[in-house]
């Protein structure tokens, strides 16, 4: 006869291990007693179980509660024993040794194989803005047994690197994802994502992108300069910008204070009824907390009767 | 070689306490579970209880339970085993016995103590 | 009044053979190993038979036990002064969830 099991049995953190010893034997032989123990080198062998033909199965007080056989029906020639609730410290040699009658004794080894799932984390990097050199955006670090796999996926454009701890029973990686900020990254996601034997399918973390910067600001609604006359109603300046985050914007009068009746709404400048008094240089200044950008107009309200009071002195000058 | 020495002989009044230790040494200690039993005079074998060496769950005869406190220290490997409210028909040897034969998981006292005569007497 | 049976004593002469009975019930012997223990006068027991039949290294073949449902007995060939002793049985008791002992035999070997 010949005892059947496993090279390696490989089971995931938590899950039971089914340890297969199997004597596949000349008919009219059969199994006395078989004995389970972990055989890693450096140990001593240390007892797990003893399954008795007649007496049925004999546990250790290491294993107290840990080991069972598995559920019936059970064939008199199988020593397979369930290892309840697998743990890291279980990873390792195990042997089965068989008595039988009239053959003798016989024995296997198998390895058992934990799997410890990564759970894996995700931090960001320092506050990205525009105008910074290469920057970290995100770390990514997932620990597990063996050791995981850690990429990225993205649209951003980037480079990674990566680096391995080893611990006693498992490896942590870490891996960084650098990349050049820039304004059109805002909002992009950037996602970890992280590959294990353990795991049913990949695990994903994913970022989203902040990337701080302001844009130069201009002043639109002095287009048309001929629009800009005594009496107009519904003038209006408005201030153009963006941002990250997004700017908020202040409108002053460079040369004095706004003239009263000029509603300030946001990044908008609305006037009343047009007067010469509305002449003068607005400044637009948006801000975040990044940085701060200005912008100035000359506004040069037009009164059609001063204009032709003007021509009939040139006239009358002439 | 494998073997359980006890602590020394006790006398107690009736109604006091005792402790006997039990330590082993020349196997991995943890790997199998201790009982203790005891033998009055001219009288049989009586089981008492049984620890797990390594968790320190125990179990006892029903006569004993809410008398007998098993313990053990792992650093020291030693077991100990408290009677309380002690009296006359306490006296007797006290032995503690490791589970197993030749290093196998039987349910068998390969190993004995030496013995530890409680004397309980007023 | 001890859960499982011996015969207080029994007795024969040298070179003989002799047999111990032990009974018990199904919740011990019919479902579980039995041990035989033999403690010489004034020391602590020693393991003579476990698993029903099987001896322990160093015991002398002239012992042998044997299981029958719910009884089980010990015979010891050859007899020698020197096993001059008590001899104890002992199973698990299923029903009591401990180990559980005959009363003990007390064998005399005459002449």
């Known amino acids: 006869g010949e005892l059947e099991t496993s090279d390696v049995v490989t089971v995931v953190l938590g899950q039971d291990a089914k340890l297969p010893c199997f004597y596949r034997g000349d008919s009219g032989e059969q199994v006395g007693q078989v004995a389970w123990a972990r055989a890693d080198a450096g140990e001593g062998a240390q007892e797990l179980a003893l399954l008795h033909s007649k007496y049925g199965l004999h546990v250790s007080p290491a294993y107290e509660g840990r080991v069972e056989q598995p559920p019936p029906p059970r064939n008199p020639l199988d020593g397979s024993v369930l290892l309840r609730n697998a743990v890291q410290a279980d990873e390792g040699e195990y042997e089965c040794r068989v008595s039988t009658f009239p053959a003798g004794s016989f024995q296997a080894r198998l390895r058992l194989r934990v799997l410890v799932p990564p759970l894996p984390s995700l931090n960001p990097g320092p506050a990205l803005e525009e105008g910074q050199g290469l920057t970290l955006a995100a770390s990514c670090t997932a620990e597990g047994s063996p050791a995981p796999s850690v990429t990225w996926d993205t649209e951003v454009k980037g480079t990674t690197s990566s680096r391995s701890f080893k611990h006693s029973r498992s490896a942590a990686v870490t891996s960084e994802f650098h990349l050049v900020p820039s304004r059109s990254m805002n909002g992009q996601p950037l996602t970890c994502v992280v590959s294990h034997p353990g795991l049913l399918q990949d695990q994903r973390i994913t970022h989203i992108l902040h990337v701080s910067f302001l844009a130069e600001a201009s002043v639109r609604g002095l287009e048309d300069q001929n629009l800009w006359h005594v009496g107009r109603e519904g003038a209006m300046l408005k201030c153009l910008s963006e941002g990250q985050p997004p700017p908020s914007y202040n409108w002053t009068r460079l040369d004095g204070p706004l003239p009263s009746g000029v509603r300030v709404d946001g990044d908008t400048l609305g006037f009343p009824p047009l007067t010469t008094e509305h002449s003068g240089i607005y400044v637009c200044h948006v801000s975040n907390e990044f940085s701060s950008r200005d912008s100035q107009v000359t506004v040069d309200v037009l009164d059609p009767q001063e204009d032709s009071g003007k021509q009939v002195d040139l006239v009358s000058a002439s | 070689q494998v073997q359980l020495v006890q602590s020394g002989a006790e006398v107690k009044k009736p109604g006091a306490s005792v402790k006997v230790s039990c330590k082993a040494s020349?196997?991995?200690?943890?790997?199998?579970?201790i009982h203790w039993v005891r033998q009055a005079p001219g009288q049989g074998l009586e089981w008492m209880g049984i620890i797990n060496p390594i968790s320190g769950r125990t179990s006892s005869a029903q006569k004993f339970q809410g008398r007998v406190t098993m313990t053990r220290d792992t650093s020291t490997s030693t077991v100990y085993m408290e009677l309380s409210s002690l009296r006359s028909e306490d006296t007797a040897v006290y032995y503690c016995?490791?589970?197993?034969?030749?290093?196998?998981?039987?349910?068998?006292?390969?190993?004995w103590g030496q013995g530890t005569l409680v004397t309980v007497s007023s | 009044q001890s859960v499982l049976t011996q015969p207080p004593s029994v007795s024969e002469a040298p070179r003989q053979r002799v047999t111990i009975s032990c009974s018990g019930s199904s919740s011990n012997i019919g479902n579980n190993a039995v041990n035989w223990y033999q403690q010489l006068p004034g020391k602590a027991p020693k393991l003579l038979i476990y698993?029903?039949?099987l001896l322990p290294s160093g015991v002398s073949d002239r012992f042998s036990g044997s299981k029958s449902g719910t009884s089980a007995s010990l015979a010891i060939s050859g007899l020698q002064s020197e096993d001059e002793a008590d001899y104890y049985c002992?199973?698990?008791?299923?029903?009591?969830?401990?180990?559980?002992f005959g009363g003990g035999t007390k064998l005399t070997v005459l002449g």
């Open positions: 020349g196997y991995t200690f943890t790997s199998y579970y």
């Open positions: 016995a490791k589970e197993g034969v030749g290093g196998e998981l039987l349910r068998a006292f390969d190993i």
């Open positions: 698993y029903d039949d």
């Open positions: 002992a199973a698990w008791d299923d029903s009591l969830n401990g180990f559980v």
